[in-house]
Structure formats: C-alpha cells, structure tokens
Interface confidence: medium
C-alpha cells in the first residue's frame, strides 16, 4: 500500500499531486509499511479495541485562513476516555478519586510503555530498532526523552505527507508559499505504541483556506449604543472602528499597513496607517462602509522583462528589494507565473485585505446629566430610609426608559436596580424620585434608554442621618 | 444583508449550454471563508450540488457533473456563473446559488430560476 | 460519496403536534450535518448546523439531534408556518456535499 491509500484521497482542489513541495514533506506515493502500521477502515470492528476503556478523540485545529506566504500552524489534542490522563513519562494513567463506568480503578496504568520499552527493545543500546519507524520506515529521531513520546502522527495534505513522533498534543506549521489560493483538506491519522508494533487510535480532518487577501476583521463600538452587533449607530456620536489582522505567524510583523476608509456619507476617503479610526455620521440613513487594507508583505518575484540586446557590460546583480501590486492571484493561483530565479533576490508584492459593511444611523440619546438632587422631605419621618428626586436632563432623542443601579461607593457591589417606562416631553427634563435605606455614600448609575441606545451618567451622593438640617451632597459627578 | 439573484435563460434547447450568472450584493464575493456554490433541484427529487468556485478562481466540480460544468468568477462585477455543456431533458431544474461557509454549509441562496431544456 | 437518506417521505400533522424528521447518512459523518427549510417557490433556508445548533433567528421550537449516521430534526409544536419540506445535507466527506431527498411536512 500507498500512503495515498491509507491516508485518503479526498480532494477539496482539484490540483493535487503536481504540486509544490512542502519543505520537510515527502510524497504520498511512498510505500507505507502495513505491517508495523495496520490499516483499518471506517467501521472496522477493531477500532472499538483500540483503546482500553473507550474510544481516544482527536481534535485537530488550525488557525486558518493564512495569507499565502505565511506559515499556518496545525494542531492536534488527544482526547482520552473520562479518567484518564497522560502522565509525565508519557504514560497513560487513570486519574485518581475519578469514578467511570467502571468504577475506580486498582491497577493505576492504562498503558505503561514505559514498562514495554524497558523489556521490549533488545536493540543494541541504540535505539535503532527495527520498529522504532514511521510509517515510511524512517527512523524515529531521538530527541532528548523520545522514549516518553508514545503517538506517531501523520498529516497528510496536498498529496503530501509529514510525520511526527508526539505526546497527547503536537503542532506542525506548513508555509503556504506554493500553496494554491483556496480550500484545503488536512487529514491527520494517529497511532499508539503497541508492543512493537502500532495501533490506530483516531482520525481527524479539517479545512484550511490559504488567501491572497489580507484576512481582515473590524469590530465598531460607540459610546450609547444598546447593541454593538447589530450594525446600528447613533447620528452625532462618534464611532470607532477596530481593524484586527488575523496574521498569526506574524508574516506582516515588518510591513507598513494602509488602511483605507470609504465612510459611504460623502466625506471623502480617509487614509491611515492607524488600526484603528473614529467617525462621526451627522445624518440619519444607511450608509456603506468599506476598508481597503493594503500591506507590503514578502512574495514571488516577477517575471523579469525581456532583456535588450546588450551594448555595454551587463553590471552585475546586486540583491533587489522590488514592490508591485497584486490584484489578481499571483504565483499561488491556479496558473502558476514563471518566477525570476535571481539569487538572493528579496521582492515584496502589495497585498490587500477588503471589509465592507451597511451600517444604519439612527437618532440616539445622546447625553444624560443629573442636574439637581433634591431630599424629599417626607410628612412623618421614616427612621431607615430616605427618598431622593434626581433631575435629570438629555440631548438626542427621546428616551422611553430609566434604570437607576444603587451600589456601594466603589460602584461594585450592586445594592439595588429599578427600571421603570418614562413618557418625557421634547424637552428631556425628567425627575426620578428613588429610596434609600438609611444614610451613608451611595454610587448611583441613571440610564436613559430607548431601542437603539442607552446613555449613563454615574454620581456618588452622601445620604446624611434623618436630621432634616442635614443637606444632601453629591458626593462627585 | 447578503442577497444572491440569479439570471440566464429559462430554456434551452437539448446539446445546447446552459448559462446562468449569480449577482452578490450586500457583501463582497472576495472573501476568504465563503465558497460560491451552484445547487439544483430536480422536479420531485432532492437537491444536487453541482459545483463551487473560490474567489481566486478555485473550481470543483461534482463527479457526476464534472466533464459538463464550467464555473468563473467575477470579482469586479460581484458575479459567478455556471455553464453547463451538452443539456438534456434530465438538466430540467430550479438552478440555485449559493454561498458556502467555511466549507461546510450554505448560508445564504438565491430564490432559485426554473430552467427548462426542451426543443 | 455519502449518500443521506430522509425518512419518512412525508408527514401528516396537524399544528400544534410534534413533529420528528429523520435522516441516515450512509457512514459517519459525525455531527457535520445541517438541515434546511425550503417552503414553496422559496429558497432553502438554514435552520440547524453541527447537527443541533440552531442558525441566527431560528425559534427554540426546532431541535436537532444525533450523531454518526443517525440524526433527527424535532419541532416540537408545529406552526402553520412550519409546513414546508426539509432537506439534510452532510459535510464531513466532500466535495461533493450530498444533500438528503427531503420530507414534507403537511397539514394532517
């Protein structure tokens, strides 16, 4: 057998075999040793068997999509049967004072294979066993404490395979450069020790993506707005935009980032080499906001242009550091470019990145202040509490609901929350009468809402003892 | 909003091509977790993909379909098309595209045109 | 390719029941299954992804379950808006997607 024909062949590109090597990959139309490495299909009955206690689940993760050129880092965790754990030795044992369904367990090892490998071996003091190979039969490299590393792991993509001797966890980084733009297929099959041989325990696929967009994500957040989500903002308030470049194996550390906004109000471009931007829309209505994200990032070089007849000296090449623009796929696409073979030549190729969204303006409150506050004098005193009235006044629209937060004066500890429908005039001026049980300092957080937004204003207030001499104070506004 | 509308010819002759075109608004067909995708529906049958395009100009193809179907993209105009060779009576159907997430499901489809291939 | 299969063909209901849709898929797709809801000259729309995961709008009325082959679409008081035809597709093996052959779900 094949590597292919174990490993699968499910194709989400149509490419596949033709392609670019993977540094450190080999071709998956090398031999696979089924011997040492039994295959077994889908539904076959001995994969029940094939650990102690339940079936071994492997998560496999990446973090996709990768700007083409970049590196994409794969990672696989072994999800054991409840109970059980990889020690420190690699081995797998049963979690103490952890009841399954077989109740708790005497003998503390699910697989000591540090137990195996002491009296298995017979191997001349190398290590250089017969069986401590991959699949391939390439021998295990011997890393400081191998020994303790008991899962063999093999990735396969792109007709390509790389194999990995590991612990309940590996991660392998792939660099996308002669990747095809698109959807890609990572299929991952691990084994256990068994003895001198290996047992399948799981197996795992994902879908990569490699792009030659600049993978871009914008968050927007504005002061009163009652939903960030919902691409709704307030008219007169400004709103940050948050661009976030998803590039986790920092491919972009060393480019200069362009960001540039189309706010879809008629306020021209705005171009920034800032991730983040403030804007204020002044009209009601909905709007279309774009971002182009453009960076200089490492690439292929182009092809060069035909060279003249020469007529003096050609002088000689020194290293090139060259830009150009990309708008459509360059040699990642699917019509691969003759690249220029210049020795040492380092060319950097423009790529961009594209946000776009409808956003909604709408009318909002705008501001909420406490004005006044006023002790209401009550006709037969109440020992324990007082009632206080709050003027409050707003700017914006009209608001249909107040809430006051009464807490401790840190504002942590919430002692008490009301809210309550308001009908206010076009004026916006308001007075909350709320109670408080007995003196000391209050945090009092008031909001003023309506379906889009929410505004709040906070103040401390010293409620005095019932000595109708003593007057009210706000504390700080 | 994402809103898909396709168009082209609600009948074709039998060996003749079929061409339809898929106009995304309300997002950008260059993004790079989505896939466009053309599904059909038979007359009384169930739904059958025929095939997906990436914005880089990716294709793949159902098997089933493979040698018959060509799908292009064009990201200036926001657009995607289908061409599928050598038509039948058994290519009668509602013609529908859609957008894949993350390769796994479709989000968002257009409201599907009945194409007929009758002479 | 995974070929799913939907049972039954059609429901008969009458609103207010529950109502329980199942589909097959020929091997493991473990829990990589959507459901559709398509209602005449209407689009399929998403209800269910992940195999019980309900989509962005979707009332709590409809569930979904299972996993590996066998999975099952619930509602659990049907609406008169319910009454539609609902398709499964898988997505762990492809391309190609394979979509069920869809039941009906009519008024009793």
């Known amino acids: 057998k094949r590597f292919h024909d174990v490993l699968g062949n499910e194709r989400p590109s149509a490419y596949m075999r033709e392609h670019n090597q993977l540094n450190g990959w080999s071709s998956d139309e090398n031999d696979w040793n089924e011997k040492l490495y039994p295959v077994w299909k889908r539904g076959d009955m001995r994969w029940k068997n094939s650990w102690k206690g339940g079936r071994v689940q492997a998560v496999l993760t990446s973090d996709s999509p990768a700007l083409v050129g970049s590196n994409i880092t794969f990672a696989v965790n072994l999800i054991f049967p409840r109970c059980q754990k990889e020690d420190a030795n690699g081995n797998i044992v049963y979690e103490k004072n952890c009841r399954n369904e077989a109740g708790l367990s005497a003998d503390p090892y699910v697989y000591n294979w540090t137990a195996w490998s002491e009296d298995s071996d017979g191997e001349n003091g190398t290590g250089q066993s017969h069986h401590n190979v991959f699949p391939d039969g390439k021998p295990f490299p011997h890393h400081p404490g191998w020994r303790r590393w008991n899962f063999i792991y093999v990735f396969h993509t792109l007709g390509q395979y790389f194999q990995k001797l590991g612990r309940c966890s590996v991660r392998v980084s792939v660099n996308t450069a002669n990747v095809t733009l698109g959807p890609q297929l990572m299929e991952v099959t691990v084994y256990r020790r068994h003895g001198r041989a290996y047992v399948p325990i799981a197996q795992v696929k994902d879908v990569y993506v490699v792009t030659d967009q600049i993978p871009v994500f914008v968050t927007m957040f504005q002061k009163n707005d009652r939903n960030s989500s919902d691409e709704t903002f307030l008219k007169d308030l400004p709103i940050m935009f948050d661009v976030l470049i998803h590039d986790p194996s920092h491919f972009l550390n060393y480019s200069t980032i362009n960001y540039k906004w189309s706010f879809g109000d008629n306020t021209g471009l705005f171009v920034s080499t800032n991730h983040t931007v403030n804007h204020t829309y002044v009209l009601n209505g909905t709007f279309s906001l774009n971002l182009t994200v453009k960076a200089a990032a490492p690439g292929p070089c182009p092809p060069p242009p035909p060279p003249p007849r020469p007529s003096k000296p050609t002088p000689s090449l020194a290293t090139t550091l060259k830009s150009y623009d990309s708008n459509t796929p360059g040699p990642a696409g699917d019509n691969p470019l003759e690249l220029s073979r210049i020795p040492d030549e380092n060319c950097q190729i423009n790529r961009y990145g594209h946000f776009q969204a409808t956003i909604t303006i709408v009318e909002g409150i705008l501001e909420v202040n406490i004005i006044q506050m006023t002790d209401v004098l009550m006709p037969v005193p109440w020992p324990e509490s007082s009632l206080i009235d709050f003027v409050v006044t707003c700017q914006g629209s009209i608001p249909t609901e107040v809430c006051t937060i009464i807490s401790d004066p840190t504002c942590e500890i919430t002692q008490n929350t009301v809210c309550s429908p308001v009908d206010v005039d076009e004026m916006c001026l308001l007075t909350v009468r709320r109670t408080f049980n007995g003196s000391g300092t209050y945090c009092v957080n008031l909001t003023l809402g309506d379906d889009t937004s929410l505004a709040l204003t906070s103040t401390l207030i010293s409620v005095p003892d019932r000595d109708p001499a003593s007057p009210l104070r706000m504390a700080n506004s | 909003q994402v809103q898909l509308q396709e168009s082209g010819p609600g009948l074709v002759k039998p060996s003749q091509t079929l061409s339809l075109t898929c106009t995304v608004s309300?997002?950008?067909?260059?993004?790079?977790?989505?896939?466009w995708s053309w599904i059909r529906h038979h007359p009384g049958k169930g739904l059958e993909w025929i095939g997906y395009i990436y914005y880089s100009g990716s294709t793949y193809s159902n098997p089933s379909l493979k040698s018959r179907v060509t799908i292009s993209v064009d990201t200036s105009k926001n657009q995607f098309s289908l061409t599928l060779s050598s038509v039948t009576a058994a290519d009668t159907a509602v013609y529908y595209c859609?957008?894949?997430?993350?390769?796994?499901?479709?989000?968002?489809w257009g409201q599907g045109t009945l194409v007929t291939v009758s002479s | 390719e995974i070929v799913m299969t939907q049972s039954p063909a059609t429901l008969s209901v009458s609103p207010g029941e529950r109502a329980t849709l199942s589909c097959r898929a020929s091997q493991s797709v473990d829990n990589n299954l959507v459901w559709y809801q398509q209602k005449p000259g209407q689009a399929p729309r998403l209800l269910i992804y992940g195999a019980s995961t309900r989509a962005t709008g979707i009332p709590a009325r409809f569930s979904g379950s299972g996993s590996g082959t066998e999975f099952t679409l619930t509602i659990s008081s049907l609406q008169s808006e319910d009454f539609a035809v609902y398709y499964c597709q898988q997505y762990n093996n492809w391309p190609p997607w394979t979509f069920g052959q869809g039941t009906k779900v009519e008024i009793k």
């Open positions: 859609a957008r894949g997430y993350n390769w796994n499901y479709f989000d968002y």
């Open positions: 309300g997002g950008s067909i260059s993004s790079f977790n989505y896939y």
